[in-house]
Interface confidence: medium
């Protein structure tokens, strides 16, 4: 039975030129984490792997850093990264937990970033 | 408290093997990984691998691969460090220790077993 | 793999002074860099992760810095219990090395 969830940072927005971290956290549950997926919609941005560590996508070097943590950063933002984004938790035992994080960009100075948290 | 107890001091010849034990208390056993580091008299520290604490499945360095082997007795919140065919340069203090995230960087150590090998 | 390279090997400072030791990765890791802290004849310490976090009770004279491949551990004001050796660790991808260490001796 799968007794986890994953906290996220929610809903954030950024300034268009600025960064922000993308962070989850999985708690409730003793499974262990073997792999972590993060996707904007249905483009895979990076991969965190239990033996193998992170791989980032060749059309996000650039613009994207893993980090801290199990998190990510996402750098040079523009307009255009508005969306979702989910950060993909593979678990043994219990399977696949998804949690969803909704970015804004906007142009001017008065966004407001989310709450941070590091994952411990 | 979070503790990680060793098992005691090992003297051992060549060719023989010896299984180190490691028992953690104050946690969930199986919701961190559990890795484990040697030191070498005088020398700094190395890191051997770790064990998935749920799935059992282990993940050795390089120089690890062969005569070692990470095993596990999640009942008694366990972790085992075996060395087959002992060599002289096996001699060393063997740390075990709590994984953050995957075995990778280690909040909670046991005090260490020190295993000499000579004949 | 990665390797990951401490200097100085050794030094020699006074309670009270300040103390930099400093970690270079053979390539980016980004922050995924621990600091430990091993007094002789016992079990390393975490003090530091994800290069800048500090651990649970350790004390803020401790501080971290740096990212890609350059790092350092900064001790301020050195107290007495300070000295022993001091290993930085990457966590970026396995193997998950240990730089050689660094001993801070008393002066």
């Known amino acids: 039975m799968m007794t986890g969830t994953i906290e996220t940072t929610g809903n954030i927005s950024a300034e268009k030129g600025g960064s922000i971290i993308l962070q989850c956290h999985l708690s409730s549950t003793t499974a262990q984490v073997t792999q972590v997926n993060w996707e904007q919609q249905d483009q895979l941005l990076a991969i965190c792997n239990a033996d193998l560590g992170w791989h980032i996508s060749p059309s996000f070097k650039d613009r994207v850093a893993p980090g801290p943590g199990l998190g990510l950063t996402l750098q040079s933002l523009t307009v255009n990264d508005t969306g979702e984004y989910f950060c993909i938790y593979h678990t043994y035992p219990d399977g696949t937990y998804t949690g969803r994080i909704f970015l804004e960009v906007l142009e001017s100075s008065v966004a407001e970033h989310g709450a941070r948290f590091q994952i411990p | 408290q979070i503790q990680l107890v060793q098992s005691g001091p090992e003297l051992k010849k060549p060719g023989e093997t010896v299984k180190i034990s490691c028992k953690a208390s104050g946690y969930t056993f199986t919701a961190y990984g559990m890795g484990w580091v040697k030191q070498a008299p005088g020398k700094g520290l190395k890191w051997m691998g770790w064990i998935n604490t749920y799935s059992g499945v282990p993940t050795y360095a390089d120089d690890f691969k062969g005569r070692f082997a990470f095993s596990l007795e999640s009942s008694a919140s366990t972790a085992y460090l075996q060395i087959n065919n002992l060599k002289n340069e096996d001699t060393a203090t063997y740390f075990c220790?709590?994984?953050?995230?995957?075995?990778?960087?280690?909040?909670?150590w046991g005090q260490g077993t020190t295993l000499t090998v000579s004949s | 793999d990665i390797q990951m390279t401490q200097s100085p090997a050794s030094l020699s400072a006074s309670v009270g002074e300040t103390v930099t030791i400093t970690c270079r990765a053979s390539e980016i890791i980004y922050t995924f860099l621990a600091w430990y802290q091993q007094k002789q004849g016992k079990s390393p310490q975490l003090l530091v992760y994800n290069a800048n976090t500090l651990a649970e009770g350790v004390p803020s004279r401790f501080s971290g810095s740096g990212s890609g491949t350059q790092f350092s551990l900064k001790i301020n004001s050195l107290q007495p219990e300070d000295f022993g050796s001091y290993y930085c660790?990457?966590?970026?991808?396995?193997?998950?090395?240990f730089g050689g260490g660094t001993t801070l001796e008393i002066k």
């Open positions: 660790q990457h966590h970026y991808g396995s193997p998950y090395t």
């Open positions: 220790a709590r994984g953050i995230y995957f075995g990778n960087y280690f909040d909670y």
